[in-house]
Each structure stands twice: as structure tokens, then as C-alpha cells.
Amino acid sequence: SITGISPITESLASLSTYNDQSITFALEDESYEIYVEDLKKDKKKDKVLLSYYESQHPSSESGDGVDGKMLMVTLSPTKDFWLQANNKEHSVELHKCEKPLPDQAFFVLHNRSFNCVSFECKTDPGVFIGVKDNHLALIKVDYSENLGSENILFKLSE
């Protein structure tokens, strides 16, 4: 269970891939599209509001083998819209929603080497936000392999 309903902290940051491509958000036909692209030098990076929540549970309850605290994050690039995992379509989408947010909007934060982070679906352990064909997608990572695959690594810069 997530400890409390309010985040322990929030920060505004731009999101980029391990290869320094920017994650951008564009309003098209009344819905938001998410792009992974090289930004022109003078173009300002889109900022995302990251809200961090503590999750506390014994492994027997969670089923994910974690027996203590985890750090969950939600990502909101614009007011009332949050990144959400669509596990059926293996996609990452922006949806307008009210609080309390659905579980699909929560991601377990993993700190990685090179000051990168990864975002694991709360609703589907072992599935991470990743980059596929210049879009964000859900990517299943085999836990027997090293989780360092570059397509699930992201950089946060405030």
C-alpha cells in the first residue's frame, strides 16, 4: 500500500533517454501524444511534474519479492494529465484523470548507474517504460538478465 495519499516530495524535471533524446508531449486532436526526439539546440525541453510516494509492504502481500519500502512515482507533463501504463497494448499513454489516481499511473522508481532511472509498472512487475521506434512503450525485462538495457534508462534534469 502507498503510505498516505500525498507525495513525500515533488519536482519538475525534463525527461530524456540514455542517448540524450528528449521526451516531448504534444496536444493533437484533443489528446496528447508522446514523442522521443532530438531537440533543436534552442528549443526548450518539456518539463514533467514527478510526484514521489512511499510504498510500504511485506513481500508476502505484494508478491514481488520486495520486503520493505519502495519509491513510487507519477509523471504529469501538464495539469490533470498523467502517464499511464496500458498493459494490454504494451503502450504508455497520457490520460486525464482525477485523484485518487489509478494504479496504472504509478511506477516503481529504480536508480541506475550513470545517474539514470527506470520506471517499472506498479501493476505489472518486470515491465518498464522504455523506448521503441521513437515512442514510449512498455517493455518486459527478463529478471535473469541485467536490467541495464539502455532502452529503459532515462535521465532527469531539473
Epitope: G68, L71, N111, S113, N115, Y143, E158
Partner: antibody, heavy 122, light 107 residues
């Protein structure tokens, strides 16, 4: 309960290497990184690096790059820190330490070993 | 690397006093700051994480505040067991770095 049990004190000659072990128990070993922090006599705390026990990836402080190697053995839930080319300034207590949150170091370090004193003297 | 500057380096205080220790980061670290207490011959003990969150089991007389570059640890009413050295640590980016420490001594 969570425990980090470190190997015993070592006395080494300058130029030698030392390998300190840290055996973890009471939690899911591969879900938490393991950090190494040292403290010279009468001095402050100095972060040396971290190993992710899941895949074995490491991050080292620049100061120790090339001299430190962190490894792990998932079958025994043990991490190792080897420091080579020892000099007298490496005389310190070496701690292994586990972050309070799985997968993340953002929430600080809440579990510490008792420390291993490494003395470097000719 | 991010430098963490702690002040004062030592403070003399009496039981019941309010003690404030400050920590400044050389660049912004959001709220990813932890405070530790260390007694001679012992490992550090986590007191505060995420700048202001009290670690489980830590007395409520300890509190933390701040974000960005400036942070504070306050002990509202010093107790005999609080005489120790206190360290701040930025947890935002590798390499993780500690402040130089503040020794709280008996006046």
C-alpha cells in the same frame, strides 16, 4: 531482521590489496543496492561506491576508480569490496550499507554493517 | 561532484536546548537529503530522509526542512543521548556525498 555481517579487521602493507566481505540476511538481497562508505580515524564519512546485486553493475566515486572493485555472490547473499595499491591514507573503518528503499538510494541508507577496520602500515 | 557544506562544525549545548544544524549543497538536489547521527565506535544511524521525513523509531524532537540547496536539522529539546556527530548526505546523484559533520558537545 535485516543484518549485514562484515569480515574481521585487517592489517596490510602499503601496495597490497584488501578484500572485505559483507553477508546480508533478512531481506531480498537482489532488490537493494549495497553501498560502501569509509571513515578514516577522527574523520568524516566518505562514499566509495555502490553495487546493484541484481545484475552486478557498479558505480564508483572518481577518487577510487581503478583501485576499487565491488562484486557480489547472489548464492550466498554476500558483497565484496576489494581495494588495491593500499597506502597509509586508506587506514579506515569500511562500512557496507543498504539503502532504506528497494531499487533506490533517494531515501537514504538505513542499514549499516558494524564496519571493518583496515590498517595500512609498513 | 556535489559538495555538501555543514555548519557549524561543532556546537556546545545543554540538555533541553534547541540545536540547529545547516547543510548547503553546491547545486540543487531537490529534496533528496538525509541526516545521520553517529556515536563514537558505532555505525551511522539514519534520522531523516527526503529532507523532512522522520525515519521510523526516531524521536519526534528531530526534524528536518529545506529543499534545493539549503537544509536544516533541528533538535527541539536536546537529550543526553543526542550528544553525537551529525552528518548530512545528498542522495540525488552519484557520487553520493556527505557533509563534514557537526559535533554536538556538552556545554
Amino acid at each position: 531482521q535485516v543484518q549485514l555481517v562484515q569480515s574481521g579487521a585487517e592489517v596490510k602493507k602499503p601496495g597490497a590489496s584488501v578484500k572485505v566481505s559483507c553477508k546480508a540476511s533478512g531481506y531480498t538481497f537482489i532488490s537493494y543496492g549495497m553501498h560502501w562508505v569509509r571513515q578514516a580515524p577522527g574523520q568524516g564519512l566518505e562514499w566509495m561506491g555502490e553495487i546493484n546485486p541484481h545484475g552486478g553493475s557498479t558505480s564508483y566515486a572518481q577518487k577510487f576508480q581503478g583501485r576499487v572493485t565491488m562484486t557480489r555472490d547472489t548464492s550466498t547473499s554476500t558483497v565484496y569490496m576489494e581495494l588495491s595499491s593500499l597506502r597509509s591514507e586508506d587506514t579506515a573503518v569500511y562500512y557496507c550499507a543498504r539503502p532504506s528503499a528497494a531499487y533506490s538510494h533517494y531515501l537514504g541508507i538505513d542499514m549499516w554493517g558494524r564496519g571493518t577496520l583496515v590498517t595500512v602500515s609498513s | 561532484d556535489i559538495q555538501m557544506t555543514q555548519s557549524p562544525s561543532s556546537v556546545s549545548a545543554s540538555v533541553g536546548d534547541r540545536v540547529t544544524i545547516t547543510c548547503r549543497a553546491s547545486q540543487g538536489i531537490s529534496s533528496w537529503l538525509a541526516w545521520y547521527q553517529q556515536k563514537p565506535g558505532k555505525a551511522p544511524k539514519l534520522l531523516i530522509y527526503a529532507a523532512s521525513r522522520l525515519q521510523s523509531g526516531v524521536p519526534s524532537r528531530f526534524s528536518g526542512s529545506g529543499s534545493g540547496t539549503d537544509f536544516t536539522l533541528t533538535i527541539s529539546s536536546l537529550q543526553p543521548e543526542d550528544f553525537a556527530t551529525y552528518y548530512c548526505q545528498q542522495a540525488n546523484v552519484f557520487p553520493l556525498t556527505f557533509g563534514g559533520g557537526t559535533k554536538v558537545e556538552i556545554k
